[in-house]
């Protein structure tokens, strides 16, 4: 029995699927994580839902998500980073479902920022640049990036690059003259932690120069 | 069935060096936290040392912080402690344990470490 | 730093219940989970209650666990002695990354 005879909307919500994700962000605000949680099923009823996680915290056993809207969200310093915390979806005391889970293997880092392309007349070739909050953290500092562009008007041909360092040379005859490209890029963790893709960054727009006829090269 | 065996004990001098391993097997190794404890003869148990699952993260007590390294190889599910400038109070049985989802649901047999001139 | 204080030997006869107690130095015994191993004569240790009052797969329920906070203690309670239940417990707990035991208790089961 559930021993929520009484209360209908608990008997319902028992029958319900409460699968969920979760992400942390390291060092995400100063010597702060963050932990954030949703569930997979948007349409899941959450009026009465809370997210408690439990272990491998300092000098607390448990601690109480903030409900943001869909998301469930907690930042704070007291995640030890070793070993395994639970994590429960509940209503009221009762745990509806849980997930042992090591907050160093669901590491989604933060977006790369100041993406930007220059065009080296010289050299016939395009240097990409762009930055990331990691290259001054004390855990998450090593990433795998994910360059990405296309032409403007491939809606779905992307090309993707990945690198290990924020700056990549795009050689100019690989591009097609006087076109408009999209270029974004986004990272993931590389180096004993393990996790998921960031956001990707802005979106960067750079054009091709026209072919020289008589060189048969770019303008 | 889990599995741990720690060996690589023995006696030494003292101010001498000894690796300790401890061989893993019947469960994930590379999602384990895995740690090092000791017992001196006829006393309690003493924390040592711990790993994350990965490596980046160690800690030590403060007796052997300095003299002692753990470390682990997983694609060989091995635990090490690399155990340098030894004393005679390091005499102990050295355990390996496992963290799992709890400290410590699984133990090794253990090691005899002796330091002794 | 904190220590966990526990007594050094208590006794039971066949049948009875006892309880180890283990008590925080400083801070409270509520922050951080307390564990509980067995360590027969001549054996490695092994969990007989983790996370203050779970009990391993394979323990009998004659094991418990709890937490005291106006005590700022831990305590193991066996109830329904039996011989095999004589060996040394500790408790352990944490202390940010590292792990606090207990000095340990032995427990003599009485003929």
């Known amino acids: 029995e559930s021993g929520y005879a009484q209360n209908g909307d608990l008997e319902d919500a028992e029958l319900d699927d409460y699968s969920f994700s979760c992400y942390s962000q390291l060092e995400v605000n100063g010597s702060q994580h963050s932990l954030t949680c949703a569930f997979e099923d948007p349409d899941v009823n959450i009026t009465n839902l809370e997210f408690e996680i439990c272990g491998a915290l300092v000098e607390v056993k448990c601690l109480n998500f903030r409900k943001l809207q869909e998301i469930y969200f907690i930042e704070t310093k007291k995640f030890l980073l070793i070993g395994k915390s639970n994590i429960c979806v509940k209503v009221g005391e009762k745990s509806l479902t849980c997930k042992k889970i090591d907050l160093t293997t669901i590491v989604k880092p933060e977006a790369p920022f100041d993406l930007s392309v220059v065009y080296r007349e010289g050299a016939n070739d395009f240097v990409v640049t762009f930055n990331t909050s990691h290259l001054q953290k004390k855990y998450v500092k090593v990433l795998m990036h994910d360059v990405a562009y296309r032409q403007e008007k491939d809606e779905n041909k992307w090309t993707h690059v990945n690198l290990s360092s924020t700056k990549l040379t795009l050689l100019q005859r690989k591009l097609q003259p006087a076109a408009m490209y999209e270029i974004k890029v986004r990272s993931i963790p590389d180096h004993y932690f393990k996790g998921f893709w960031s956001e990707w960054s802005p979106s960067y727009y750079f054009r091709t120069p026209e072919i020289n006829n008589s060189s048969g090269e770019m303008d | 069935q889990v599995n741990l065996r720690e060996s690589g004990g023995g006696l030494v001098k003292p101010g001498g060096s000894l690796r300790l391993s401890c061989a893993a097997s019947g469960f994930t190794f590379d999602d384990s936290v895995m740690h090092w404890v000791r017992q001196a003869p006829g006393k309690g148990l003493e924390w040592l040392s711990l790993?994350?699952?990965?490596?980046?993260?160690?800690y030590y007590a403060d007796s052997v912080k300095g003299r002692f390294t753990i470390s682990r190889d997983n694609t060989k599910n091995l635990l090490y402690l690399q155990m340098n400038s030894l004393r005679a109070e390091d005499t102990a049985v050295y355990y390996c344990?496992?963290?799992?989802?709890?400290?410590?649901?699984?133990w090794g047999q253990g090691t005899l470490v002796t330091v002794s001139s | 730093n904190f220590m966990l204080t526990q007594p050094h030997s208590v006794s039971g006869s066949p049948g009875k219940t006892v309880t180890i107690s283990c008590t925080r130095s400083?801070?409270?015994?509520?922050?951080?989970?307390v564990q509980w191993y067995q360590q027969r004569p001549g054996n490695s240790p092994t969990t007989v209650i983790y996370e203050d009052d779970q009990r391993p797969s394979g323990v009998p329920d004659r094991f418990s666990g709890s937490i005291d906070s106006s005590s700022n203690s831990a305590s193991l309670t066996i109830s329904g002695l039996v011989t095999e239940d004589e060996a040394d417990y500790y408790c352990?707990?944490?202390?940010?990354?590292?792990?606090?035991f207990g000095g340990g208790t032995k427990l003599t089961v009485l003929c």
């Open positions: 352990q707990s944490y202390d940010f990354h590292h792990l606090v």
């Open positions: 344990a496992r963290q799992g989802d709890y400290m410590g649901n699984n």
């Open positions: 400083s801070g409270s015994i509520d922050s951080s989970y």
């Open positions: 790993v994350g699952w990965d490596g980046f993260f160690t």
